[in-house]
């Protein structure tokens, strides 16, 4: 029986040209994490395998940094990076857990504007 839950950063926003940390955390299970895949749609960003370490997809090799931990740092953001990201935890013996993060990349001025006029 799968008892674990994935906690994620949920919906996040970041400025164009900046960077963002995509982070998930698996809790409430003693299952062993064997691999974490980071994907956008069906496209691979990176894999962290417990035995083999990190593999970054060719499409992201110049702007993805492994970590912190099992997370992923996405750099030099563009508006095209807006969308859903998935952390897929391969565990033993539970199986696969999936977490979802929605990233919105904003033009710098929009992000600054949003920050200045936050609702208290």
């Amino acid at each position: 029986m799968m008892t674990g839950t994935i906690e994620t950063t949920g919906n996040i926003s970041a400025e164009k040209g900046g960077s963002i940390i995509l982070q998930c955390h698996l809790s409430s299970t003693t299952a062993q994490v064997t691999q974490v895949n980071w994907e956008q749609q069906d496209q691979l960003l990176a894999i962290c395998n417990a035995d083999l370490g990190w593999h970054i997809s060719p499409s992201f090799k110049d702007r993805v940094a492994p970590g912190p931990g099992l997370g992923l740092t996405l750099q030099s953001l563009t508006v095209n990076d807006t969308g859903e990201y998935f952390c897929i935890y391969h565990t033993y013996p539970d199986g696969t857990y999936t977490g979802r993060i929605f990233l919105e990349v904003l033009e710098s001025s929009v992000a600054e504007h949003g920050a200045r006029f936050q609702i208290p």
Partner: antibody, heavy 120, light 107 residues
């Protein structure tokens, strides 16, 4: 020495499915991706996709999504590619190759190729 | 997808010649380029990775160079066993794509 031994040629009817195998010897199967490449006369080489045998994670060239399905059997060090709903366009030589896990983006050893002929 | 073009589809040269095979990408690929050799029997081997790094076991008469969108493979002293078709492949981003190949023949 490293070897990728592919299954023999196949002659199939349109609409059928076929499963091509690629048996790896001479290296640690889990430390490498298995890549699949199609070659048709006059069409050069086309990358179909890849599978990481240690976890079964598979990624596809969008052009071949729904056409090809990759699996791997760690116990026999064998990777498989199934091609479904065959048409004459699928007649080709199919190669498997290996790519080291991590940031190694080249196919350093290739199988001998499997010729698929689709004909009624 | 990035298109890889090998404008010369076939090339004839004499034994001992210096031969250069070119490949161009539809956009800059930052030296993320490999070269493969396919023998007439279908056997494929890696020659060069990351534009100019020689794969282990490959004779030193093979070399690679280039930058931006334009790349080349040079065979400095053509030998009979070099008769083959040569393919470039980029890995700037997925999907990986290959050039159409250059078939090398002996005069």
């Amino acid at each position: 020495q490293v070897q990728l031994q592919q299954s023999g040629g196949e002659v199939m009817k349109p609409g059928a499915s076929v499963k091509i195998s690629c048996k790896a010897t001479g290296y640690t199967f889990s430390n490498y991706w298995i890549e699949w490449v199609k070659q048709r006369p006059g069409h050069g080489l086309e990358w179909i996709g890849e599978i990481l045998p240690v976890s079964g994670s598979a990624y596809y060239n969008e052009k071949f999504r729904g056409k090809a399905t990759f699996t791997a059997d760690k116990s026999s060090n064998t990777a498989y590619m199934q091609l479904s709903s065959l048409t004459s366009e699928d007649s080709a030589v199919y190669y498997c190759a290996r790519q080291k896990y991590g940031n190694y983006y080249y196919f350093d050893y290739w199988g001998q190729g499997t010729t698929l002929t689709v004909s009624s | 997808d990035i298109q890889m073009t090998q404008t010369t589809s076939s090339l004839s040269a004499s034994l001992g010649d210096r031969v250069t095979i070119s490949c161009s990408a539809s956009q800059g690929i930052s030296n993320y380029l490999n070269w493969y050799q396919q023998k007439p029997d279908g056997t494929v081997t890696l020659l060069i990775y990351y534009t100019s790094s020689l794969h282990s076991g490959v004779p030193s008469r093979f070399s690679g160079s280039g930058s931006g969108t334009d790349y080349s493979l040079t065979i400095s002293n053509l030998e009979p066993e070099d008769i083959a078709t040569y393919y470039c492949q980029h890995y700037s981003k997925l999907p990986y794509t290959f050039g159409g190949g250059t078939k090398l023949e002996i005069k």
